[in-house]
Amino acid sequence: SQVSQNCHNGSYEISVLMMGNSAFAEPLKNLEDAVNEGLEIVRGRLQNAGLNVTVNATFMYSDGLIHNSGDCRSSTCEGLDLLRKISNAQRMGCVLIGPSCTYSTFQMYLDTELSYPMISAGSFGLSCDYKETLTRLMSPARKLMYFLVNFWKTNDLPFKTYSWSTSYVYKNGTETEDCFWYLNALEASVSYFSHELGFKVVLRQDKEFQDILMDHNRKSNVIIMCGGPEFLYKLKGDRAVAEDIVIILVDLFNDQYFEDNVTAPDYMKNVLVLTLSPGNSLLNSSFSRNLSPTKRDFALAYLNGILLFGHMLKIFLENGENITTPKFAHAFRNLTFEGYDGPVTLDDWGDVDSTMVLLYTSVDTKKYKVLLTYDTHVNKTYPVDMSPTFTWKNSKLPNDITGRGPQ
């Protein structure tokens, strides 16, 4: 049913879904704090622009009686229940922030006539791609896939002279929400990644992974997995690894690699870590002090969601345009706005662009070092270390298939 929006006459409200099922186990209080900090910034920016309006947030909590798994498995209905709650109360803001689970976002998008924008900190799965009124402020699976294909094909760097066309993917079903959807996208037979690779096998058992490390008959030297170094250690331990194995560890939302005095453990020497470039001020800002390095990005996405709304509100008000229109709902894409920690760019489909960073472990210094960066906006790789102090022979990444010569 059509719900009237609390979104006119100088008063603009943001509906924030505070769901029990969330992409990251972040206390809702921290998300509230992030939203409130964002509101303060937005009010200041609007005031500076001479716009005398009120901006508030309404936090919509689910009762948690039915949907209490805490992760995303039972989120599908929780999102719809919250929308029903909003509908019954006849209280919808100009914009909806949350949900973060792919299941709930997909279902809410499917089952509602969305004439308002939806901003998500999460919704990583491919099923949430190309949604006209959905904006995602954390890197979705599609962006990861494009990096991997780009990197696999690269063969003109001093440290990577072979194109790769094969891979193992380790996916055992215990992954976090972000990893679940990232690996899901790599596994999907119809995805861009699968389409571009000649060989790809999913390893589902710990033993399968462990066996591959020294298997002379393996079909690929490259293994993709998702999680932190501890996750890898639990799986790999101190087992011997063939010298031409390359493990790509996807750990996007983890700033720990960049903290002072971090030393890479020995078991990381065969590993390239794919993570996101950390914000400069975030490393010691008051906002992030109480958050773990992994959860910083999640709370930051909520905060940036508020700033994005403020940015769009300012533009529409300055142009004398109506906020409760399809034009406003479809406007949250193909733009750059001032985020909490610098400019944030959204692509044509409302998905955040970022700089991904591929790290290696220096055998000289036992420190993580940047091998290359990748700009998701232009799908381009920028090498940083032309002769890395790798564990691999001749400071070069091996071929993906043992014994295959130059291509």
């Epitope: 690699y257 960049f258 400069n280 790290l359 220096s362 420190k367 070092k369 940047v370 091998l371 270390d385």
Partner: nanobody, 127 residues
Framework: QKQLVESGGGLVQPGGSLRLSCAAS????????IGWFRQAPGKEREGVSC???????NYADSVKGRFTLFRASAENTVYLQMNSLKPEDTAVYYC?????????????????????WGQGTLVTVSS
Amino acid sequence: QKQLVESGGGLVQPGGSLRLSCAASGETLSNYNIGWFRQAPGKEREGVSCISQIGFTNYADSVKGRFTLFRASAENTVYLQMNSLKPEDTAVYYCAVTGGRWASCSFLPLRQDFESWGQGTLVTVSS
């Protein structure tokens, strides 16, 4: 004091390219933040670009998109690739190092942040 040696300068036509290198003896350069500076005749020394210990780079607005800074860790060298050179790029180019994990490479390198300097290499852009 760390011994830094710059090389690769010379005379080049506008629109041309040069690659400067900064090498260190007896020190592992990738343990430090490296800054490149330049000083044109009669002008203050200014920051051009830097690379932090972990490998993040930053550039002055005047050189963004034209200059690229990268490492060659195994050679213990840092390179400054300069493309689309302009007459106003004419200067003596210096490299400098400082410890500290982040130092000022998130921002433009400031002179006072760097403790060891090379002798400089002259770049002249002229037709």
